[in-house]
């Protein structure tokens, strides 16, 4: 009776279990009743990092110097290239696909410390009573407007991203 499931590092095809190709190799042909799975090593600048049945290897990541990137760790047939940014620059994400001089603080956060040559921008959440409605690399959280000092009342509460909205007091006739 043909199998419905295969062991680890195997895959089911044509009602039989074939061996997966090991990391660093791609599939050339599936196994048959009489032959083993045929695999081939990935070419230069290619990789596969898992046991697989892929017919094409993945291209190594390119660390584009025009984006401020350089190679942190050269790729192998089993691993992708790891990029990092030029000295003094910061990756925009874990994948490090582009570089920025320093990060900015999103709305709801203020700048606690402006970036220097050796440290990135330090952001802090705006506490109650303060807000920031912009992305910035220098602006702190701003205090909510004080409606009382303008002889007005709060019509809409403030948040960490928005100022309070003041309005006229209801006058009793």
């Amino acid at each position: 009776e043909p199998p419905t499931a295969c062991r680890e590092k195997q895959y089911l095809i044509n009602s039989q279990c074939c061996s997966l190709c090991q990391p660093g190799q791609k599939l050339v042909s599936d196994c048959t009743e009489f032959t083993e799975t045929e695999c081939l090593p990935c070419g230069e600048s290619e990789f596969l990092d898992t046991w697989n049945r892929e017919t094409h290897c993945h291209q190594h990541k390119y660390c584009d110097p025009n984006l401020g990137l350089r190679v942190q760790q050269k790729g192998t047939s089993e691993t992708d290239t790891i990029c990092t940014c030029e000295e003094g620059w910061h990756c925009t994400s874990e994948a490090c696909e582009s570089c920025v001089l320093h990060r900015s603080c999103s709305p709801g956060f203020g700048v606690k410390q402006i970036a220097t040559g050796v440290s990135d921008t330090i952001c802090e959440p705006c506490p109650v009573g303060f807000f920031s409605n912009v992305s910035s690399a220098f602006e702190k959280c701003h205090p909510w407007t004080s409606c009382e000092t303008k002889d007005l009342v709060v019509q809409q509460a403030g948040t960490n991203k928005t100022d309070v909205v003041c309005g006229p007091q209801d006058r009793l006739r």
Partner: nanobody, 116 residues
Framework: EVQLLESGGGLVQPGGSLRLSCAAS???????EMWWVRQAPGKGLERVS?????????YYADSVKGRFTISRDNSKNTLYLQMNSLRAEDTAVYYC?????????WGQGTLVTVSS
């Protein structure tokens, strides 16, 4: 494509003044915080000054406070840096930059040399 073109640099004597300009294109200038950053020979990048999109709030590094003034004209898509009482230590290439400071969105800079 974002383009930032700095101009106005040159050779000036200590105590002199210069006004740098940065012509911006390829993005909505009025929506972005803008910065002036400089790089002295053999040194790292130094954040000099910044201005918010509306031009109502500014930042200055301690080294230039009271001597430099940042401003912007959103109708002309241009950023300015008025530099007074220049010192030898202000010698550097000056760059303008927009948030979020992508490496590939920088201009070529303009060289300011302060020397007698």
């Amino acid at each position: 494509e974002v383009q930032l073109l700095e101009s106005g640099g040159g050779l000036v004597q200590p105590g002199g003044s210069l006004r740098l300009s940065c012509a911006a294109s390829g993005f909505t200038f009025r929506d972005y915080e803008m910065w002036w950053v400089r790089q002295a020979p053999g040194k790292g990048l130094e954040r000099v000054s910044a201005i918010n999109p509306q031009g109502t709030r500014t930042y200055y590094a301690d080294s230039v406070k009271g001597r430099f003034t940042i401003s912007r004209d959103n109708s002309k898509n241009t950023l300015y840096l008025q530099m007074n009482s220049l010192r030898a230590e202000d010698t550097a290439v000056y760059y303008c930059a927009k948030l979020p400071f992508f490496f590939h969105e920088w201009g070529q800079g303009t060289l300011v040399t302060v020397s007698s």
